[in-house]
């Protein structure tokens, strides 16, 4: 018996095509993805294919303007259309609160929405009850499938699940479910979840009775053969592991915002063992046609998105400091914004020793792209931050130790002076350089703001502590040459979109006023500094 | 929270009718995928017949085709199962269920929100 699985994940909001590199889409004969044409793939597959599932591993929320107007009503109508089979729960799905998934998502969808390790607790277990599910058989022709979900244990960090969701282990969670599909006869199992690809491998190798993997979360790209695209291959496709019992369980993630459709084909024998499985993510490019009928209804949602660009967030009544001259060279106030309400975006107080998990922010200055002006009634849109944060990127989280952010900080002055884009911008962090000494030798200072206080206060980065800082994706993937941020990070979640952040903190403060106010410091003569 | 309660079993003479009800709350129905399920003494739990989301498809079980018929009210949160010609064989007790999918089944597998089912006695 043959089946076949299509899955996305990670499409963080990308429902109109976008450009080769995932941002807007410039010109329309070279754009990728997109539920429109996702849907002219899926389709074709589903008539030419007896027994098709499609599947996503989640994380539909959070990444463009459709989120910040539609705030996941459009992730079920445009699911409901394509008519996914069934959803695992993603930590982006908690961004806007249990309510935020419960009313747009889990009420509207046509499809089950799956986690096997969030459970509920206190008042909110009975409001949930039933709208999301550990596990589902899903009839596949004359056979049925269970497909059982998890979430990544990380998502109280990464996001806004509030205090009565309790997200446990995946493998400990997952096991017993496995075992009550074995017990209702339900023997081919596919798991399907958000925890990235190590803990993907873990699952097929540790939960009993899994036959199938198909994750998410860690944006990972396998292919077999040459690579259709820019994305480098982390592995195979499948991804082949060997379970602790001698099977061979295929793995499958198909990188992320909807340029793929990943494509693996199953053949189980009648005791629902695998016996082969093959395939490739398919990546959907222009030679695919966009579905006219998805299409037009894409173009009339859009409409409100055009109006939501214009109108004011909030005001400014000091002149928001962008520009190249500025942020590539000291302190900049625009830099300074960005970076509070980056922070702002992370609190989390899930931990009474911690008045917060993370107090540092690191921002390359050739990533901010614009300055703003107060003197337009010190007005401030969708539009206007779309100028100043225009790459389409998120705002992560990583763990580093002290050493590698003394390299990163050394690496942002190496080369002072040529209007480079490496010069950091920062948060929760106080940094003295002196551009007299030699390049790799110009931090003299570098004090870094305690979480684990009642009153935070500045205290001399320790270079062997691990430490939490929230940076742009582009820095914590090396670039702008931080390649010692993304050899060495100890670990790396992908959080939310630029905009999205710093207008959320915009409408928050309604009135803005940030200054330069000494964060950076920098002197370009011998002086003596005393280290305590 | 989700809740199925039928309504409308009863004894009833062979060759003759009932029409059973489920009533459904919690959630709006035409979301979901009803079945309805019987259950004679001693015998495994069986598919009757089934309904797609918006009742366009519906599917029976050989035992009962031509004879019962399932449809629902989705304005009222109603399904219902009108059965005819009545059989000593269909005596049991029935339920009612509901999953979210795109395929109407008979499987007992794939729904997830039972009702607690209403006795049907098929006697004379």
């Known amino acids: 018996w043959e089946l076949t699985i299509l899955h996305t994940n990670d499409v963080h909001s990308r429902l109109e095509q976008t450009s080769e590199d995932s941002s807007k889409c410039v010109n329309a004969s070279r754009c990728m993805g997109g539920v429109a044409r996702l849907f002219t793939k899926v389709q074709q597959i589903r008539r030419a294919e007896p027994n098709v599932l499609l599947l996503d591993a989640g994380d539909q929320y959070q990444g463009t303007i459709w989120f910040t107007v539609y705030k996941g009503a459009e992730v079920a109508h445009f699911m409901n259309a394509l008519r996914y089979d069934a959803m695992a729960l993603g930590n982006h799905e908690f961004d806007n609160g249990v309510e935020g998934l419960i009313e747009p998502l889990l009420k509207e969808a046509k499809f089950p929405i799956l986690s096997a390790n969030i459970k509920a607790k206190g008042p909110l277990a009975s409001q949930i009850s039933g709208l999301y599910l550990p596990y589902k058989v899903l009839p596949v022709g004359d056979e049925v499938v269970g497909i059982v979900g998890y979430t990544s244990k990380e998502t109280p960090f990464l996001s806004n699940p509030g205090t009565n969701l309790v997200f446990e282990d995946e493998i400990t969670a997952l096991q017993p479910e496995v075992d009550k599909l074995k017990t209702l006869n339900v023997n081919k199992i596919i798991a399907l979840g958000h925890s990235g690809f190590e803990m993907d491998k873990l699952i097929a190798q540790k939960v009993r009775g899994v036959d199938v993997v198909v994750g998410g979360h860690s944006n990972t790209f396998l292919y077999t053969g040459n690579p259709p695209s820019k994305e480098v291959p982390a592995g195979k496709y499948p991804f082949i592991v060997t379970s602790d019992d001698g099977r061979k369980v295929p793995v499958v993630q198909a990188y992320a915002f909807g340029k793929y459709l990943g494509y693996l084909k199953i053949e189980f024998d009648e005791r629902g063992n695998v016996i082969s499985s093959h395939g490739n993510p398919i990546l959907l490019n222009s030679s695919i046609p966009e579905d006219p009928s998805i299409k037009a209804d894409i173009n009339k949602w859009r409409i409100k998105l055009d109006n939501y660009s214009t109108q004011e967030l909030g005001k400014t009544i000091v002149y928001l400091d962008g520009s190249s001259q500025s942020c590539r060279f000291r302190e900049c106030n625009m830099g300074n914004l960005i970076c509070d309400a980056m922070i702002n975006n992370n609190l989390r107080h899930t931990d009474e020793m911690f008045w917060n998990h993370v107090s540092m922010c690191i921002l390359n200055g050739g990533g901010i792209r614009s300055p703003i002006d107060e003197r337009n009634n010190g007005t401030i849109t969708w539009e206007n931050l779309a100028a100043v944060l225009p790459f389409g990127g998120t705002f992560d989280l990583v763990q580093l130790k002290g050493s590698t952010l003394k390299k990163a900080f050394e690496h942002s002055v190496h080369r002072y002076g040529q209007s480079t884009g490496e010069f950091l911008q920062v948060g929760g962090i106080h940094v003295v350089y002196d551009l007299s000494r030699k390049p790799g030798d110009r931090v003299v200072k570098l004090d870094v703001l305690c979480t684990k206080c009642r009153v935070p206060s500045y205290d001399p980065l320790k270079m062997d502590e691990v430490y939490k800082v929230i940076l742009p994706n582009f820095l914590a993937n090396g670039g702008d040459g931080f390649q010692m941020i993304k050899d060495e990070l100890l670990r790396h979640d992908s959080g939310d979109q630029d905009i999205n952040v710093v207008s959320t903190y915009i409408s928050k403060m309604k009135v803005i006023y940030p200054a330069v106010e000494g964060r950076i410091k920098a002197h370009h003569h011998h002086h003596h500094h005393h280290h305590h | 929270a989700l809740q199925l309660v039928e309504s409308g079993g009863g004894l009833v003479q062979p060759g003759g009718s009932l029409r059973l009800s489920c009533e459904v709350s919690?959630?709006?129905?035409?979301?979901?995928?009803i079945g309805w399920f019987r259950q004679a003494p001693g015998k495994e739990r069986e598919g009757v017949s089934c309904?797609?989301?918006?009742?366009?498809?519906?599917y029976y079980a050989d035992s009962v085709k031509g004879r019962f018929t399932i449809s629902r009210d989705n304005a009222k949160n109603t399904v219902y199962l009108q059965m005819n010609s009545l059989k000593p064989e269909d005596t049991g007790v029935y339920y009612c269920?509901?999953?979210?999918?795109?395929?109407?089944?008979?499987?007992?597998?794939?729904?997830?929100?039972w009702g607690q089912g209403t006795e049907v006695t098929v006697s004379s």
């Open positions: 309904s797609s989301q918006s009742g366009g498809s519906t």
């Open positions: 919690g959630f709006t129905l035409d979301y979901y995928n």
């Open positions: 269920a509901a999953y979210r999918g795109w395929h109407p089944s008979l499987d007992a597998r794939v729904y997830d929100y």
